[in-house]
């Protein structure tokens, strides 16, 4: 049942004498495995025997017998899928039909494959794209319907018999669909390749020539042109004539139109291969070319640079850069249309010729303010001297110059004055727009460049200003030299080093930290009264009456400054002691009498002692001695003694008289 056998393989295989053939083949015998396989050459069915007759190239049977031809012909297949065959070497007489007789347990099949073996290697076939244009990449294909594992070959590309530099990509196919060897070459043809012969050469593994195919390239390209000019150097003077001729060296397809261009723009009514220019002017200087078109597009000749020579035109000056910053570099360029180019230049600054400047460019490495002004130039070539143009203005910018800080006040300045300063400068470009002051303070700027310091401090030493445009220039600091009253006046005790006792020699020093002007006077005062006019206040022998609050004053021409009040404390033993009696020095018996020990002491009395008329000390130690009730026997003279840390003092005697009461007198 034919429907059960399915084969896939190339319909025809090609080879040449001595080569080999590899036949890729697959099959499907659906009812079971292959049991017998015979390869026939040109098989014919014999109806009588119901078998095929023909040369048996290969036979595989159940008993495994193989004919001697088996060495040349190999069945590389299997019992159910693969039916690939190899004939190596292949011979001319192998051409014809190969018959694959397949038998399974129940079914039989004859599959036919055509084999075309030539006497000599057949040529490959070159395939070209339908149209080739210059500079457009194309792929050239060389195809050979042959490939065999046992017979390696190579395809080589040649251009005009010379191997091509471009790398070719070779591919091989040995499949049930196709058997071939292919070489592909990517190639960008130039117009010069037109008409050239391209060859694809088949070679064996050793590079021996086997066969080839050739094609002639048809490269479409724009017209290729040559331009000729009279005079040949294309250098003329105004009024001369010029002839230009355009020649086509190649065009594929043929050209259709001709035109001429100057500086890329088409010249009207110039459609012949010759361009005649009569009595040329300088405006006709430029780059000329001819343009010829075909179906591919326009082709242009090389450009001819026509130079119409003339004397320099009025010059202009270009400045790099203006405005310029002082100290920077500046370049001046003299621009003058001329042909040939000027060979000599004359430069002018503010109308005055600049000596030694003959170049097109003038370079000033370090610009100074005096370089500002108008720059102009004159250009000169072999045909004459040009005119001086309008010139260009160089603006030199620089920080303010000669900045000074000026004190507007009459001198001297006194502490507390309002000081006005101005910031002056000599010149500036651009104009001064602002001012800065050092040190910074909460000061007024009533107008631009004027500083007002209200209530100037004694310690305001120097002030500096800066005038600023794009830059700030600082003036040297100016000394305000503020005059002020003496500062930090204080009283300092020089002697004694310890506490002051009555009778000590005492010296007080009046110190101050600074004064401007330096010439000073000293004054000492106690409770508003002037005591001395020296820096020291001396007491040869201090007394308690000298104690109190002292201040020293230091005067200069600006004012006077006082110290803080300084307390002078004098320590002394109790003095001026006296005994006072209350209610009086005569008291009636039975009443109360209080004796008080009054004294003057510093520090105050800490201990009192009472004595009677016999100088007997009494057992009382407080300031007051209270006698209650007072008796007649208490009559007599009393005195007291006071003690402090400095010493002792005693009072004179005070007499207490105690008289009898009326009752006592009545009883007597």
């Amino acid at each position: 049942d034919s429907s059960k056998w399915v084969f896939e393989h190339p319909e025809t295989l090609y080879a040449w004498e001595g080569a080999c053939v590899w036949i890729p083949c697959t099959y499907r015998a659906l009812d079971g495995d292959l049991e017998s396989f015979i390869l026939f050459h040109n098989p014919e069915y014999n109806k009588n025997t119901s078998k095929f007759d023909g040369t048996r190239l290969y036979e595989s049977t159940k008993d495994g017998k193989v004919p001697s031809e088996q060495k040349r012909v190999q069945f590389l297949g299997d019992k159910n899928k693969n039916c690939t065959l190899s004939i190596h070497p292949v011979h001319l007489n192998d051409s014809g039909q190969l018959g694959l007789r397949m038998e399974s347990k129940t079914e039989k099949w004859m599959e036919r494959i055509h084999l075309n073996v030539s006497e000599r290697p057949f040529p490959p076939h070159i395939q070209l794209p339908p149209e080739i244009q210059e500079s457009q990449e194309v792929t050239l294909t060389c195809l050979l319907n042959f490939s065999c594992y046992g017979y390696p070959i190579q395809l080589q590309w040649l251009l005009e018999g010379v191997p091509m530099r471009q790398a070719a990509v070779t591919s091989t196919s040995l499949t049930i669909k196709s058997v071939f060897t292919r070489s592909e070459l990517k190639f960008s043809p130039q117009w010069s390749h037109h008409g050239k012969i391209v060859t694809c050469q088949l070679q064996d593994a050793d590079g021996k020539f086997l066969s080839n195919d050739t094609v002639q390239l048809n490269v479409k390209h724009t017209p290729k042109l040559e331009i000729k000019v009279t005079p040949s150097d294309a250098i003329v003077r105004e009024g001369d004539s010029v002839t230009m001729t355009c020649e086509v060296s190649s065009s594929n397809p043929e050209y259709t139109t001709v035109s001429w261009l100057k500086d890329g723009t088409s010249l009207k009514k110039q459609n012949t291969f010759t361009l005649n220019l009569r009595e040329v002017t300088k405006d006709q200087s430029g780059k000329y070319c001819c343009q010829v078109s075909n179906d591919v597009g326009p082709g242009r000749s090389e450009e001819v640079f026509l130079q119409v020579q003339y004397a320099p035109e009025p010059s202009t000056v270009q400045i790099l850069h203006s405005p310029a910053v002082e100290g920077s570099q500046v370049e001046f360029l003299c621009m003058s249309l001329a042909n040939p180019l000027p060979t000599n230049y004359t430069w002018y600054h503010n109308g005055k010729e600049m000596q030694g400047r003959t170049e097109e460019k003038v370079h000033i490495p370090k610009i100074l303010p005096w370089h500002a002004g108008t720059y102009s130039c004159v250009a000169e070539n072999i045909l004459g001297t040009g005119q001086r143009g309008p010139g260009a203005e160089l603006d030199v910018q620089y920080p303010p110059k000669k900045v000074t800080t000026v004190i507007q006040n009459p001198m001297p300045i006194r502490e507390g004055d309002t000081v006005t300063l101005s910031c002056n400068y000599n010149s500036s470009n651009p104009s001064v727009t602002r001012y800065e002051w050092k040190p910074h303070g909460a000061w007024e700027e009533p107008s631009l460049g004027v500083l007002k310091i209200q209530n100037v401090g004694w310690d305001n030493t120097t002030i500096a200003c800066a005038a600023c445009n794009s830059w700030c220039s600082w003036a040297s600091p100016v000394a305000l030299n503020v005059q002020y009253a003496p500062r930090d006046v204080r009283v300092r005790k020089i002697k004694p080093l310890s506490e002051i006792h009555s009778g000590n020699s005492v010296s007080l020093q009046c110190d101050f930290s600074s004064s401007h002007p330096k010439e000073v006077q000293f004054f000492w005062e106690k409770n508003g009264r002037l005591l001395g006019k020296e820096s020291q206040l001396n007491f040869d022998s201090i007394s308690p009456e000298d104690a109190g609050s002292y201040s020293c004053w230091v005067n200069n021409s600006i004012g006077q400054t006082a110290s803080k009040a300084w307390t002078l404390e004098v320590l002394y033993a109790p003095r001026r002691l006296r005994v006072s009696m209350s209610p009086g020095d005569q008291v009636m018996e039975g009443k109360s009498a209080t004796l008080t020990c009054e004294s003057d002491a510093n520090p105050p009395v800490s201990h009192y002692t009472w004595f009677d008329w016999n100088n007997q000390s009494l057992p009382y130690h407080s300031q007051k001695l209270r006698l209650e009730p007072v008796k007649v026997q208490h009559s007599g003279a009393y005195w007291c003694q006071g003690t402090n840390s400095v010493g002792k003092g005693r009072s004179p005697l005070s007499t207490l008289t105690v008289y009898y009461s009326p009752e006592t007198i009545g009883r007597r």
Partner: antibody, heavy 113, light 107 residues
Framework: EVQLQQSGPVLVKPGASVKMSCKAS????????MNWVKQSHGKSLEWIGI????????SYNQKFKGKATLTVDKSSSTAYMELNSLTSEDSAVYYC??????WGQGTSVTVSS | DVQITQSPSYLAASPGETITINCRTS??????LAWYQEKPGKTNKLLIY???TLQSGIPSRFSGSGSGTDFTLTISSLEPEDFAMYYC?????????FGGGTKLEIK
């Protein structure tokens, strides 16, 4: 007896100046400092400044610098105070005082347009 | 400058009573504080200086105390002539400064 006799009351226009006097007697004028004190109506006392009657050296309260100027004439034992650029804020009674112990009776200054 | 706070600003008392007036300074002034009495039609009278020193001719019922920043004027056994305005003043350093005053009135 120490006495400080001050000049009489004054009425002045704003912007004007006034100079008042304080004549001392009963002590050696140049031996003592002289203080000046301001008392605005219904307010406390403000110390203006002090002058050394011997040297003429002065010391001012910062508040009154530029407003008050103190001087002395030793030959007449008189102290002076000049107030300038007067405004209504300067309307007050002004006292001279020898230290703190003796005071003048005061000079009334009224600033009004 | 040294600031002085005087209290009370107003005080009513009866003759024979004892009263105190206080002054506090913004910084230490040692003991250099004075007390004045101000009466209409009379010149200001110095009562006490250096905190506690009684000015000559002033009755002993007036006394002063304190040092550093806190000071007190005491009038013991008030007399009718004592009803007046009282001011304290520091004389430790210039500028001298005064308290706001205390008005002593008869109750």
């Amino acid at each position: 007896e120490v006495q400080l006799q001050q000049s009489g009351p004054v009425l002045v226009k704003p912007g004007a100046s006034v100079k008042m006097s304080c004549k001392a007697s009963g002590y050696t004028f140049s031996d003592y400092f002289m203080n000046w004190v301001k008392q605005s109506h219904g307010k406390s006392l403000e110390w203006i400044g002090i002058i050394n009657s011997y040297s003429g050296g002065t010391s001012y309260n910062q508040k009154f610098k530029g407003k008050a100027t103190l001087t002395v004439d030793k030959s007449s034992s008189t102290a002076y105070m000049e107030l300038n650029s007067l405004t209504s804020e300067d309307s007050a009674v002004y006292y001279c005082a020898r230290w703190m112990d003796y005071w003048g009776q005061g000079t009334s200054v009224t600033v009004s347009s | 400058d040294v600031q002085i706070t005087q209290s009370p600003s107003y005080l009513a008392a009866s003759p024979g009573e004892t009263i105190t007036i206080n002054c506090r300074t913004s910084e230490s002034i040692s003991k250099h504080l004075a007390w004045y009495q101000e009466k209409p039609g009379k010149t200001n009278k110095l009562l006490i200086y250096s905190g506690s020193t009684l000015q000559s001719g002033i009755p002993s019922r007036f006394s002063g105390s304190g040092s550093g920043t806190d000071f007190t004027l005491t009038i013991s056994s008030l007399e009718p002539e004592d009803f007046a305005m009282y001011y304290c003043q520091q004389h430790n350093e210039y500028p001298w400064t005064f308290g706001g005053g205390t008005k002593l009135e008869i109750k």
